[in-house]
């Protein structure tokens, strides 16, 4: 790869204009912050590829990295990649804008890194300070990256001298992830248990020999010593446990449990804690909310969801209608309780194909020996449109009428509809909606009826047409909020002689 | 020269609409979350909201979700709260802050407070 | 919603006395909880982050520790310009919430 000019480093003026140019044996890119920029790409009569990248009106915000690389690498015997880094001193840039990745430096060791503090002059004189501090920090500076070294977990802020003002970068965070050679880890039989019952925790470390385990726990603090028990998990090599076991549990015993390990030949250490609550008696609260009016659609499968806390483990019943529900043996009711997290419940009560006769007041019931909770909810079927009926009469007034019949749940409303050129329609026309408009030429009369039986509504609509003179096509479209349906008559004058 | 300035306050009949505009300066304003905390007379610091970098997150506490929205402007370096359906226990001095939220490490996420703060704006909402 | 409770609610004390606030948490939050300190007519000024780290430029004499449910700051020497409303702060899945305040006073 040839770049032109060939830098390293070059420094270009403010607002102005200048042309970059690479060349190679294969098709080649110029790539700027990871992507490609606009640029001229053409292939030579000698088999050479070029790519021109032209800046243009250039300001501070083009400093940086610039690369040359073949297009397609594959195929190739090295990823050949060329790098320019440009300077373009901007008075009216201070430093350049990081993103959140750089702000927020993070480590899992020792080790250096780069505070990537950069600004669009090489000449300027830049600085590392701690945030909020005066004193610049020893560290060595690159213009082209930012400052270099080992540092501490704090935050830090550049700064420089641009004319006569003092410019400060972002703040950069330094922090250090927690990674020991030990691993440890502490769990616990419960992390809830009632005033009486059994606490008892392990705390477990692999691969070391020698290891000495330290509990701290809330009895301790009162004087009150427990001995932990610790063994070696002898099915896999270098497991080894501690136990802490506390009987009888009292209200006081609640608290942060903490095994801290040490390893003393390399001086390492690590500690775990865990939070144990003691209850004076068990408890069962609701999580969330359920609305007091749930919906199911007619022949589809609804699943009804409670989430709750609880400890001990409770009983969990589902009524309808104050009737005890039971997965039926048809498979059109499930019920499930599942286990969520130690004291985190999840009830389900999925009614499969939901039928009419499913309607209803629903209430769960969770219980034990200690509290009960009880939620209640009305379940409403939703039944899909169906216009059942429409038909056209001629009345001896004159007039002509359409009715339209049809059901649905909730309460459908009625939408008609007409169009006059029977060949565009409805493909290249619109059909016009009717109702009782102001020009009397239809009247509308619509009556709903609830089924109690069926649980829906039923919607009967006559529209009365004063004076048909050519063929109309009537349209009555039933909507609510779980379909539509739509049927359509053809009304003709009386004068003529047939009828569609 | 790390700075946050609010604008907008004024008495507002209650179902009254407002705008606040909170204008950064001296940082990247694009590369921070962003805050709304405020504060009734006489109380305790209450947290309103809050807006990821490029707007994809928006978080508010329950007592104004619906009412109220959280926007932003990073061109401009402004950051807004449009608050509808005003009432009477809205009235407090409103600050905007920068929220320290680092990108997310794997499954963990991490939390640095909220360093800068605005001088705040005062709504009141009072008939 | 994550409730945090401070005590004491005002706190009468001397200067060069050793102050110490506590916050609770109503449920664990490892150790995301940041403490501020607010003057009056003034926007709050951050002192500690992630339980226990001090921000830059925080007098050393405040300290903050805790973790899960139980957090504390501690002031070791109180000085004459600590007198003010201290906060607590939770951070949970991008939420935020306040512990009511503590205000130290001079006695």
């Known amino acids: 790869l040839v770049v032109t000019p060939p830098g390293p480093e070059l420094v270009l003026n403010v607002s102005s204009t200048f042309v970059l140019t690479c060349s190679g044996s294969a098709p080649v890119v110029w790539e700027r912050m990871s992507q490609e920029p606009p640029q001229e790409m053409a292939k030579a009569q000698d088999g050479t590829f070029s790519s021109v990248l032209t800046l243009t009106n250039l300001t501070g915000l083009d400093t940086g990295e610039y690369f040359c690389t073949h297009n397609d690498s594959r195929g190739l015997e090295t990823d050949e990649r060329k790098r320019l880094y440009i300077f373009v001193p901007d008075p009216t840039v201070g430093f350049l804008p990081n993103d959140a990745e750089e702000l927020f430096i993070f480590l899992t060791e020792i080790t250096e890194i780069t505070i990537p503090c950069r600004v669009t002059d090489p000449q300027l004189v830049v600085t590392l300070h701690e945030k909020k501090g005066d004193v610049a920090l020893p560290v060595p500076y690159d213009h082209q990256r930012g400052f270099s070294g080992i540092f501490e977990d704090r935050s830090y802020i550049c700064k420089t001298t641009i004319g006569d003002r003092e410019v400060d970068s972002d703040a950069y965070y330094v922090y250090r992830l927690q990674v020991s050679s030990i691993n440890v880890s502490v769990n616990a039989v419960q992390t809830v248990v009632r005033q009486g019952e059994n606490i008892t925790l392990m705390c477990i470390v692999i691969g070391n020999e020698v290891v000495n385990f330290e509990w701290t726990y809330p009895r301790k603090e009162s004087g009150r010593l427990v001995e932990p028990v610790t063994d070696f998990l002898l099915d896999m090599p270098y497991h080894i446990r501690s136990i802490l076991h506390i009987p009888s549990a009292e209200l006081e015993d609640s608290g942060t449990y903490t095994c801290n390990v040490t390893e003393s030949v390399n001086d390492h250490q690590d500690e775990k804690a865990i939070n144990i609550t003691v209850v004076e008696s068990g408890y069962v609260r609701l999580l969330g909310e359920v609305g007091t009016l749930q919906f199911a659609e007619l022949h589809r499968s609804r699943t009804l969801q409670v989430v709750f806390e609880a400890y001990p483990p409770p009983t969990v019943l589902w009524f309808k209608d104050n009737r005890t529900l039971g997965d039926s043996s048809a498979g059109e009711i499930a019920l499930s309780t599942r286990n969520v997290s130690e004291t985190r419940y999840v009830s389900e009560l999925t009614l499969v194909r939901v039928k009419v006769a499913e309607a209803g007041h629903y209430t769960m019931r969770a219980f034990h020996e200690d509290a009960e909770v009880q939620l209640s909810f009305q379940l409403q079927i939703n039944v899909p449109v169906r216009v059942l009926e429409l038909s056209e009469s001629h009345p001896d007034s004159g007039e002509q009428t359409v009715r339209c019949r049809g059901r649905g749940m909730p309460q459908p409303n009625i939408i008609w509809s007409a169009c006059r050129d029977l060949k565009r329609c409805p493909r290249e026309l619109p059909p016009t909606l009717l109702g009782n408009s102001s020009e009397e030429e239809s009247q509308l009369e619509t009556n709903v009826t609830y089924w109690e039986e069926e649980q829906e509504f039923e919607v009967v609509s006559t529209l009365r047409l004063q004076h048909v003179d050519r063929p109309l096509s009537v349209r009555c479209t039933l909507r609510n909020a779980v379909g539509q349906d739509t049927q359509e008559v053809i009304v003709v004058p009386h004068s003529l002689p047939f009828k569609v | 020269q790390v700075q946050l300035v609010e604008s907008g306050g004024s008495l507002v009949q209650p179902g009254g609409s407002l705008r606040l505009a909170c204008t950064a300066s001296?940082?990247?304003?694009?590369?921070?979350?962003m805050s709304w905390v405020r504060q009734a007379p006489g109380k305790g610091l209450e947290w309103v909201a809050n807006i990821q970098q490029d707007e994809n997150e928006k978080y508010y506490v329950d007592s104004v979700k619906g009412r109220f929205s959280i926007s932003r402007d990073n061109a401009k370096k402004s950051l807004y709260l449009q608050m509808n359906s005003l009432r009477v226990e809205d009235t407090a001095v409103y600050f905007c802050?920068?929220?320290?939220?680092?990108?997310?490490?794997?499954?963990?996420?991490?939390?640095?407070?909220?360093?800068?703060w605005g001088q705040g704006t005062t709504v009141t909402v009072s008939s | 919603d994550i409730q945090l409770t401070q005590s004491p609610s005002t706190l009468s004390a001397s200067v060069g006395d050793r102050v110490t606030i506590t916050c609770r948490a109503s449920q664990s939050i490892s150790d995301w909880l940041a403490w501020y300190q607010q003057k009056p007519g003034k926007a709050p000024n951050l002192l500690i982050y992630?339980?226990?780290t001090l921000e830059s430029g925080v007098p050393s004499r405040f300290s903050g520790s805790g973790s899960g449910t139980e957090f504390t700051l501690t002031i070791s020497s109180l000085q004459p310009d600590d007198f003010a409303t201290y906060y607590c702060q939770q951070y949970n899945s991008y939420s935020r919430t306040f512990g009511q305040g503590t205000k130290v006073e001079i006695k």
């Open positions: 001296g940082f990247t304003f694009s590369s921070y979350w």
């Open positions: 802050a920068r929220d320290l939220v680092p990108p997310r490490q794997g499954d963990y996420y991490h939390y640095f407070g909220m360093d800068v």
């Open positions: 992630k339980a226990s």
